[in-house]
């Protein structure tokens, strides 16, 4: 953890080092004041590597609903609508933080968890495996 | 929030409804047991809509380092390496949860925050705006 100067106005903490258990306010502050507010909502269909979004729901997790992208094809879509299999559609993945209820079903106790989610797909030049 | 049966083994909580302030264990559990373990690490370069990754650091945030993707071109890269401006490179964005120290500099008190990050880029067919 990063050493941070302790502020006298902070809530009490037994451990003065980087904490293992912390208090988290769940009133989410939304910082999405993007200078490019165009949502990615239609990219999944317009992309040369189109994808579908699947709902992943887990009441023991916060957020309970996460949308997972699945690439529609192994190849990439050409201008004429046909699939070009000399190119590959691949998922763009990101590791995100979620809160997992621990112990299970407890409303006010969580553990931080890292999960890998697929956000969308991109079209890449294939890896050529050369046979010796 | 979702109504969850309260477990007698849960830590004490004043509020029996969905909590506003919760305890979070920061010992991160990593769930990345994917059946498709191929990392996205080289996609940024092989993509027809390549991107660069920029480091965004904030000691008041957890995680303190987030990598932001910026598309290299407005168009998409063709097989010959030239850029095709009849297609558009666009960022795939995702809303993620982070922990923001609140009050500032406090080591054990956070607020949940939603931020929009660009994870990578994809190549899309442009929207054609017809002039009346």
């Amino acid at each position: 953890g990063i050493a941070i100067p302790r502020n006298s106005g902070c809530p009490n903490s037994e451990d003065k080092n980087f904490p293992r258990t912390v208090m988290v306010n769940l009133n989410i502050h939304n910082r999405n004041t993007s200078t490019n507010p165009k949502r990615s909502s239609d990219y999944y269909n317009r992309s040369t590597s189109p994808w579908n979004l699947h709902r992943n729901e887990d009441p023991e997790r916060y957020p309970s609903v996460i949308w997972e992208a699945k690439c529609r094809h192994l190849g990439c879509v050409k201008a004429d609508g046909n699939v070009d299999y000399h190119m590959n559609s691949v998922p763009i993945q990101q590791e995100i933080l979620v809160l997992r209820r621990e112990p299970r079903h407890c409303p006010n106790s969580f553990r931080l968890e890292k999960i890998l989610v697929s956000v969308g797909c991109t079209c890449v030049t294939p890896i050529v495996h050369h046979v010796a | 929030g979702i109504a969850i049966p309260r477990n007698s083994g849960c830590p004490n909580s004043e509020d029996k409804n969905f909590p506003r302030t919760v305890m979070v264990n920061l010992n991160i559990h990593n769930r990345n047991t994917s059946t498709n373990p191929k990392r996205s690490s080289d996609y940024y370069n092989r993509s027809t809509s390549p991107w660069n990754l920029h480091r965004n650091e904030d000691p008041e945030r957890y995680p303190s380092v987030i990598w932001e993707a910026k598309c290299r071109h407005l168009g998409c890269v063709k097989a010959d390496g030239n850029v095709d401006y009849h297609m558009n490179s666009v960022p795939i964005q995702q809303e993620i949860l982070v922990l923001r120290r609140e009050p500032r500099h406090c080591p054990n008190s956070f607020r949940l925050e939603k931020i929009l990050v660009s994870v990578g880029c994809t190549c899309v067919t442009p929207i054609v705006h017809h002039v009346a």
Partner: antibody
Amino acid sequence: QVELRESGPGLVQPSQTLSLTCTVSGFSLPSHSVSWIRQPPGKGLEWMGIIWNNGGTDYNSAFKSRLTISRDTSKSQVFLKMNSLQTEDTAMYFCARNMYITDYYYENYFMDAWGQGASVTVSS
Amino acid sequence: DIVMTQSPSSLAVSIGETVTLNCKSSQSLLFSENQKNYLAWYQHKSGQSPKLLVYWTSTRQSGVPDRFMGSGSGTDFTLTISSVQAEDLAIYYCQQSYYTPYTFGAGTKLELK
């Protein structure tokens, strides 16, 4: 348990439109994709098209101009409409659920549950 | 379209025998990004709906007995049924799900000697 059931007319006149319904149970359409496959008498299986979990479709180009797949999620039904039928469209028509694999980041075109099939004869 | 060629078209077997069914694709079904082969095997018994046995060449679908074993890579694939049982008598189809349209082989009919 997962079940798919095809229904529709057994006999269709040439040049007319075929309408088939696939009623599903044991899974939800917003979670799974459904494909249509047919098998002409004495021949192999032929994939016709798919309706994805989000309602989008993809078709075998051999049928593209005359095939439409749609659905009604509230009734758990998937529909196949194919116009300009000819005698060579006589076949057993199956609907099938496309396999869903968690933590696998591609749509799946393997079918893990099939209906019993609807026999369609095109004849005057 | 990708052509899937199955051989033999029919096979007469005795109960307890081990049999090999072949499937050849006109193009490679190996996806370079994840090293998976996009090939499945189905069993179709008369009067019933087809049943998925194996996908990704060798992954058995849940509930499928381990006497069914898929193998191969690229363009050549086999389904081996060790110690054939009476309930295994059916038509077996291979299917590729790499290229659209997703195509099937003509089938191999497994019958009793």
